[in-house]
Each structure stands twice: as structure tokens, then as C-alpha cells.
Amino acid sequence: KLLQVSTIAMQQQEKLIQQERALLNFTEWKRSCALQMKYCQAFMQNSLSSAHNSSPCPNNWIQNRESCYYVSEIWSIWHTSQENCLKEGSTLLQIESKEEMDFITGSLRKIKGSYDYWVGLSQDGHSGRWLWQDGSSPSPGLLPAERSQSANQVCGYVKSNSLLSSNCSTWKYFICEKYALRSSV
């Protein structure tokens, strides 16, 4: 009889432990849900406020017409520069017109002076053709002025008001470009 009572007591204790564990799991789950809810609300709040303030370009980016530009404060090789831009939802600068080139060089003069800045232009190793990163050809007036005598891959950069070429593995500042947000008014 005593053995039977003892067995029942042990079973009850085991049940109690399981219930405590379930309660603990539930509390943990509830806490996790609350945290996720908090994160969701913060994200929604952020999205709403940024939509409300709806500036066409992010902070520290410069706007010109439909584009936003970011002038880097760090040096990197061409390929890393491209990846740095992609992190920001942008690509290296692609200059489509003389007007855009003038805007960029004018802005650089104000910001930093005469440094080298990678743009999204590279030379095909086989054909020697210059192509923008999206595969399009630059307009004739926007071809790098000097042909780099490098056996390595050659990429384009802006300096002062010129488009020049250099070994892609050299370190330079870079300029990213993304589309400006259109206001939905």
C-alpha cells in the first residue's frame, strides 16, 4: 500500500515537473512573441514615419533629378566598392549624360576636392570595350581619357572633371547611385 502511494506521489511529481516545464516554455514563447511584436511595431513605425517624411534620398546622400548619390569616406578596390554600394541598395555611379557628369564633378569639388572615385565602368579584358556595370555602353563623350597600360583588369574612375582608368585593384574612394524615391502626392 505504501509502495503504491509512493508510486502515485512520484507520478504526480513528474506531472508537476512537466507542467512547470510547459509553463516555462509558454512564458518563454510569450516573451519571444512580445519581443517580435515590439520589433514589428518599431519597424512599422519606422516605415510609416519615413514614408511620412518621405525624403527622396537617405541621409548623407545627394539628390540630382531622379538619382541619389553617396560619396564614400573610405577607400576600397573596385569590386569591394561595388559590394559596398549593393549593401546600401545601390550600385556604383553610372554616368548617363554630360549634365550628370557636371553635377557629380561640381559636387565633388564642394565636398572633397581632387580625389579619385571609382564609378561603375570597366573594360572588357578580351574586346577592350568599355561597359557600364549593367552591360550598356558609355556615350562617346563619356569614355575614359587615358588607356591604362595594365595587364590586370581596368576600371573607370572620376577625378576633378575627368573620367580616367586604372587597375581595378588600386584603392580609391567610390560613388554609389540609387533611384530617388518618387513622392506619391
Epitope: F43, L86, K87, E88, G89, S90, T91, Q133, D134, G135, E177, K178, Y179
Partner: nanobody, 116 residues
Framework: QVQLQESGGGLVQTGGSLRLSCAAS????????MGWYRQAPGKQRELVAA???????AYADSAKGRFTISKESARNTVHLQMSSLKPEDTAVYYC??????????WGQGTQVTVSS
């Protein structure tokens, strides 16, 4: 946790085509860019093509004119259409996402083999 699932890899003859797809699932709130890298045996991983949230494109020189990247934003999916394939395109192709929290997520990779 974010998962990236690649598909579409395989064995193809020189001059052939393949379409790689990558579907992202999990807690992704904002994607800045999506893209494809590849790694051939004994070589470094290199960017093949990428597309930003706004639709701007970036291709490696080796991909220009032969590969096309596209995305389906609603489904968090990115595709890489590869044509005129060459033996030197043989590699493991990895899908990647640059998220708004500055995290970069990677898929497990899909093997592409181009036989001559």
C-alpha cells in the same frame, strides 16, 4: 532565421543555357539587394550579378551580354538566366541577399557544370 534555397543547377553542354532561381524565406523585413556569386575549384568567390531593390543592375565583365538577373519582389525570389555557357562558367553558384540591417545572407549553393 533567413533561408535561401537555390535551384536550377546542373550539367549542360557548351553553348547551352540554365536558369538558376533562389527563394528567400524566414524573417526578412527589408532587402536592399539580391545577387549571385560563384566559386570555381581553387578560386575565390566572385560576384556574378546583382539587382537592387530599385532595379539597378550590376554584372561581372564575364557575365555581361550572356547572363540576365531578374527578381520577383513579392516572392523574395531572384533568378539568373545564363546562356552561351562556357566551361569556365563551371562553379558552385551562391545566392546572396544584402538586408537593410546590413547582414548578408547566403544560400548553400548549386553546382553548375559546363562540359565541352
Amino acid at each position: 532565421q533567413v533561408q535561401l534555397q537555390e535551384s536550377g543547377g546542373g550539367l549542360v553542354q557548351t553553348g547551352g543555357s540554365l536558369r538558376l532561381s533562389c527563394a528567400a524565406s524566414g524573417s526578412i523585413f527589408n532587402i536592399n539587394s539580391m545577387g549571385w556569386y560563384r566559386q570555381a575549384p581553387g578560386k575565390q568567390r566572385e560576384l556574378v550579378a546583382a539587382i537592387t531593390v530599385g532595379g539597378r543592375l550590376a554584372y561581372a565583365d564575364s557575365a555581361k551580354g550572356r547572363f540576365t538577373i531578374s527578381k520577383e519582389s513579392a516572392r523574395n525570389t531572384v533568378h539568373l538566366q545564363m546562356s552561351s555557357l562556357k566551361p569556365e562558367d563551371t562553379a558552385v553558384y551562391y545566392c546572396t541577399i544584402w538586408a537593410a540591417d546590413y547582414q548578408q545572407y547566403w544560400g548553400q549553393g548549386t553546382q553548375v557544370t559546363v562540359s565541352s
